[in-house]
């Protein structure tokens, strides 16, 4: 009996036309939501004038439906048993699942000012930028609507730069009508233990953002894993959101709508400094902000963001070193709310429920030549927002899963 089940599973998890896996893989049957909490700065003037701690108050959730679009340009390659695709991006605001509207205002760091002062270290250039910042009446902080902050706005300061620069700024700009990829993944036809594992991303096996093994594209995209998952496994996956591969380890058995699943979590060790976890040495890209690679819990992804000083962390700086959160007041990290987990059905390797949590931060540094940053006495990794992307298998699908997979085994 078990062999027959194994044979059936192996057949059905292959990523090709006609299998259960393929149908759900092309277009997820699960409703996926992305909730945002924005960090509203309460004391912008005090920070700018006196280099005070930044007082933030999170406001949210503001919820969007995401991942509702089918994969595009799905192309099988029989020669190397891979399938390539683009993952289109789309977000639809869900007012009924939100605390306000997309027109709600927030006081946040001025993204353009922080980024320009970081990208252009040249003092002559900073003096030119300072003039443009002053002319445009820009400051260290700005008031922006949710829609502007997430999806983009025309920045008044950048609009004055007399050179070809992108004048539209937004944390996720551009998003709608764009796609992530091309991904090329193994379809599992020749070797089921490789199914869904990424072969190449954007035509390459490496990212070109990191040194050594940190630059590798490992595992799947976390939507599924090769079947027959063991609790002892370390599940590798690649997340383009954080510009790196990461891993999850088994935490507990969970019953999800009558389906036994394994809960895998991202461990704190994955965010540790190289002092604690030597494997992470290549995620430390500079010595000053990282305090000689002793800081932990924040990832400098500037190389992946055209030099903009974007730092990724867990929400509320969960698992981050005290020096990172010290200049920020109003954060309350807790594991239950702020960690990332994947609930994986072990026989098929399908992720039936997940919560992906991350925080977007921007580095702002003192600048002698830029007036609005002149009074800063220290560097700040400023939290802008955190997000919770979740998906849970629907009741109908769960019933189907129970009857066709887990029910047959039990």
């Amino acid at each position: 009996g078990d062999l027959l089940i194994q044979k059936t599973i192996k057949k059905q998890v292959v990523l090709e036309e006609g299998t259960i896996a393929f149908k759900n893989w092309v277009k997820t049957g699960t409703e996926v939501y992305r909730q945002f909490w924005i960090f509203d700065v309460q004391n912008p003037q005090e920070v700018m004038m006196n280099s005070s701690n930044i007082q933030v108050k999170q406001r949210g959730p503001y919820t969007y439906r995401v991942r509702f679009l089918a994969k595009e340009n799905v192309t099988q390659d029989a020669e190397d048993n891979t399938v390539s695709f683009l993952q289109p991006n789309g977000a639809i605001f869900e007012p009924s699942l939100s605390v306000g509207t997309e027109a709600d205002n927030f006081t946040v760091l001025n993204l353009a000012v922080a980024a320009a002062s970081h990208i252009y270290q040249n003092q002559f250039v900073q003096m030119i930028l300072n003039s443009l910042i002053n002319k445009s009446k820009s400051s260290m902080f700005q008031v922006r609507t949710l829609r502007e902050l997430l999806w983009g706005y025309r920045d008044p300061f950048l609009s004055l730069v007399p050179y070809p620069v992108t004048t539209t700024v937004g944390l996720f700009y551009p998003y709608n009508n764009t796609a992530d990829g091309v991904y090329k993944v193994f379809n599992g036809k020749d070797n089921i233990s490789k199914v869904a594992i990424i072969d190449t991303y954007k035509g390459k096996r490496n990212l070109s953002y990191w040194e050594s093994h940190c630059d590798m594209i490992n595992g799947t995209d976390a939507a599924s894993f090769p079947p027959f998952v063991e609790k002892s496994q370390v599940l590798q996956f690649f997340s383009s959101d954080i510009c790196r591969s990461i891993y999850a380890v088994f935490e507990s058995d969970v019953n999800l709508k009558g389906i036994p699943v394994y809960r895998f979590v991202l461990p704190s060790k994955a965010f540790a400094s190289p002092v604690e976890n030597p494997d992470n040495y290549c995620f430390c890209t500079e010595k000053i902000i990282s305090k000689n690679c002793t800081s932990y819990g924040v990832l400098d992804i500037s190389k992946c963001k055209e030099g903009r000083p974007v730092y990724i962390s867990l929400p509320h700086f969960l698992y981050a070193s005290p020096d990172v959160s010290e200049p920020i007041d109003g954060l309350n990290p807790n594991e239950e709310e702020h960690r990332t987990y994947l609930d994986i059905e072990p026989i098929t390797g399908f992720t039936l429920q997940f919560a992906k949590r991350l925080q977007v931060n921007l580095l702002v540094k003192p600048s002698e030549k830029i007036q609005v940053l002149k009074n800063l006495k220290r560097n700040y990794i400023v939290p802008i927002l955190w997000l919770n992307e979740t998906g849970t298998i629907g009741d109908e699908k769960a019933n189907m899963f129970r009857s066709q997979v887990t029910g047959k085994i039990n």
Partner: antibody, heavy 118, light 104 residues
Framework: AVTLDESGGGLQTPGRALSLVCKAS????????MFWVRQAPGKGLEWVAG????????LYGAAVKGRATISRDNGQSTVRLQLNNLRAEDTGTYYC???????????WGHGTEVIVSS | ALTQPSSVSANPGETVKITCSGG???YGWYQQKSPGSAPVTVI????KRPSDIPSRFSGSASGSTATFTITGVQAEDEAVYYC???????????FGAGTTLTVL
């Protein structure tokens, strides 16, 4: 030693264009912002134009804005000043200068004289 | 523009101070011994001195005012001294009108 050699000066006709070239040596040219400064006969120094180390950012003095273009070739270690629609008041000695990093000059060329006259 | 005195005079061996104000940033001081001869940088970035410039030349800055000092002035120091810097109101690099130093 740091040397900056200007060329391209001489007698010019009003309304015409002028191209001055500064050839740099003795330092890593691509690491420095470069400026042009001029001095009219019997007058003080006047800042004309500046360009950052990789040529992305340029800035011009009020008297030449809209008529001047500063450019650089880091491979050749040269900086060029193109001045269009020449006027009599553009007459003077034009100096190439190296920025020490904070709009503060630490080296000068010997200068090239420009006379705009009909 | 930057403001500096039009002239100062001193006896050999005396200390001369020239001030410059109105700039937003680092100042430089430039010596020109005769009109048409190339300027020579004596101080850049407020207080830095090129290696070939004698130690009697020094500079300092506080706020938007820079001070250039010659301690023990010599006859060969007779020249026009220009200060240069950044003018925030004008948004560009500027020079002062020059200070003529006469050594009596």
């Amino acid at each position: 030693a740091v040397t900056l050699d200007e060329s391209g000066g001489g007698l010019q006709t009003p309304g015409r264009a002028l191209s001055l070239v500064c050839k740099a040596s003795g330092f890593t040219f691509s690491s420095y912002n470069m400026f042009w400064v001029r001095q009219a006969p019997g007058k003080g120094l006047e800042w004309v134009a500046g360009i950052d180390d990789d040529g992305s950012f340029t800035l011009y003095g009020a008297a030449v804005k809209g008529r001047a273009t500063i450019s650089r070739d880091n491979g050749q270690s040269t900086v060029r000043l193109q001045l269009n629609n020449l006027r009599a008041e553009d007459t003077g000695t034009y100096y190439c200068a190296r920025d020490s990093g904070a709009v503060s000059i630490d080296a000068w060329g010997h200068g090239t004289e420009v006379i705009v006259s009909s | 523009a930057l403001t500096q005195p039009s002239s100062v005079s001193a006896n050999p061996g005396e200390t001369v101070k020239i001030t410059c104000s109105g700039g937003d940033s680092d100042y430089g001081w430039y010596q020109q011994k005769s009109p048409g001869s190339a300027p020579v940088t004596v101080i850049y970035q407020n207080d830095k001195r090129p290696s070939d410039i004698p130690s009697r030349f020094s500079g300092s800055a506080s706020g938007s005012t820079a001070t250039f000092t010659i301690t023990g002035v010599q006859a060969e120091d007779e020249a026009v001294y220009y200060c240069g810097g950044w003018d925030g109101s004008y948004d560009g690099a500027v020079f002062g009108a020059g200070t003529t130093l006469t050594v009596l």
